[in-house]
Interface confidence: low
């Protein structure tokens, strides 16, 4: 009773298109596999970034597969051939490992590369992104950006920099089409006459990022004798309400400091009839049925209501 | 009031494949989030597969990367479930699932729990 085996994939590889992080993954049929034309070959692909303690493992059909990476550390990926056991009268077989690595030469120390990258996507609409020059690099150095997410067909430059002594210090980017809910990718590179300058490589998803402005048209209701109902109305912009957390600060006679996270634009509050001052503000974040992080807005304006008598139906300013 | 109905399930080899669909009704809202369920004989809910109807974005769980796909068609208002390979281990019954407060699917093993809408459910057996 011979041993079936099977021998692993060919050619296998990690192929840069040049999208800053995205990857593809891509092998051939193994050898000799003419015993098993009645079957459907499959693979079992294993990929991690160097250094991370877990595999991504995925089983294909198909001669490749994509995913994002990130460019500042190493790729390393291997593939091994399974024949299922409709193929082999029994259990699984599979062959041994094919295993490859993909990694950027760096180029510079690491100081040189760009520091303290921050990215904020302004109400949903408008991405900007800023860092600060390497430590120790001269003044002739200067960063270039390049980013790209699923449906540009090559890396793109930046067009607008923000500029501080003549050098590149962000970027404000371009209307950015169907670009969120999925992986953007940045890479700022840079050049110097006097030293190579080391790369940096970014992933985030913009919706993650997102700053919305900050709430307007504040106003107040009076709903019984102890209850004013606090109001707001959403920024205007391409966010639904649906998306939004509000945090409220309300100050009542200049003591007390009331703070509350509501889902809703309104906010009842319990008050007293010694109550001669009321002030509140509000601020605005995307919440997690949108994203999965962000960033609070800037607080409202603050609204205020002063006077002997705050019974009065509505108090509006 | 959401109306969820699955079907295509049914008997399997292992190394098989079925379709799942689900097709949805009564909902007036267009963004939303819609995914697939399942629960083992015995087990506890296990997320398998989540889609967005405004954005491309489509999650797996670890367990059915690069065998099952999920998909949709606005116009007939249906989801699908594409699943190749069947091991044993995905006999479940398997659960149509719609949020209409998220737009995007958490990449997270416990969202199942935030889905606001189910279907009855449809089993799938794979056995030889």
């Known amino acids: 009773d011979t041993e079936i085996k099977v021998n692993p994939p060919q050619d296998f590889e990690i192929v840069d298109p040049g999208y800053l992080g995205y990857l593809y993954l891509q092998w051939q049929p193994p050898l000799s596999l003419d015993h098993f034309k009645e079957c459907t070959v499959e693979y079992e692909l294993k990929y991690r970034n160097i250094g991370s303690e877990t595999w991504k493992t995925i089983i294909t059909k198909n001669l490749h597969y994509k995913d994002g990476f990130d460019l500042n550390k190493g790729i390393e990926a291997k593939i091994h051939t399974l024949l299922p056991w409709q193929c082999t009268n029994g259990s699984e077989v599979q062959s041994s490992w094919a295993e490859t690595t993909y990694w950027i030469s760096p180029q510079g120390i690491p100081e040189t590369k760009v520091q303290d990258m921050d990215c904020v996507y302004y109400n949903w609409q408008y991405l900007l992104c800023s860092w600060k020059p390497g430590i120790g690099v001269l003044l002739d150095t200067n960063y270039n950006l390049f980013y790209w997410y699923e449906g540009l067909d090559h890396a793109l430059q930046c067009v607008d920099y923000i500029k501080a002594d003549g050098q590149n210090i962000g970027c404000r980017f371009p209307y950015l089409e169907a670009s969120d809910y999925k992986d953007f990718y940045i890479c700022v590179n840079g050049s110097s006459e006097n030293k190579p300058i080391r790369s940096s490589y970014f992933t985030f998803q913009l919706q993650n990022i997102v700053k919305p402005l900050p709430p307007v048209y504040l106003t107040f209701t009076r709903e019984s004798s102890c209850e004013i109902k606090l109001k707001w109305s959403i920024p205007l912009g391409p966010i639904p309400a649906r998306c939004f957390d509000y945090e409220i600060e309300i100050r009542e006679d200049d003591t007390t400091l009331v703070t509350a996270t509501v889902e809703n634009e309104t906010y009842t509050l319990k008050t007293t009839n010694e109550t001669r001052q009321l002030c509140f503000v509000v601020r605005s974040k995307v919440n997690i049925y949108c994203s999965d992080d962000g960033i609070w807005s800037e607080w409202s304006d603050k609204q205020c209501w002063e006077g002997e008598d705050l019974s009065k139906k509505t108090l509006l300013r | 009031e959401v109306q969820l109905v699955e079907s295509g399930g049914g008997l399997v080899q292992p190394g098989g494949s079925l379709r799942l669909s689900c097709a949805a009704s009564g909902f007036a809202s267009d963004d939303y989030i819609m995914g697939w369920v399942r629960q083992a004989p015995g087990k506890g809910l296990e997320w398998v597969s989540c889609i967005s109807s405004r954005y491309a974005n489509t999650y797996y769980a670890d367990s059915v990367k690069g065998r099952f796909t999920i998909s949709r068609d606005n116009a007939k208002n249906t989801l699908y479930l594409q699943m190749n390979s069947l091991r044993p281990e995905d006999t479940a019954v398997y659960y149509c699932?719609?949020?209409?407060?998220?737009?995007?699917?958490?990449?997270?093993?416990?969202?199942?729990?935030?889905?606001?809408?189910w279907g009855q459910g449809t089993l799938v057996t794979v056995s030889s």
């Open positions: 699932a719609m949020d209409s407060r998220r737009v995007t699917c958490p990449e997270i093993s416990t969202m199942h729990r935030n889905f606001d809408s």
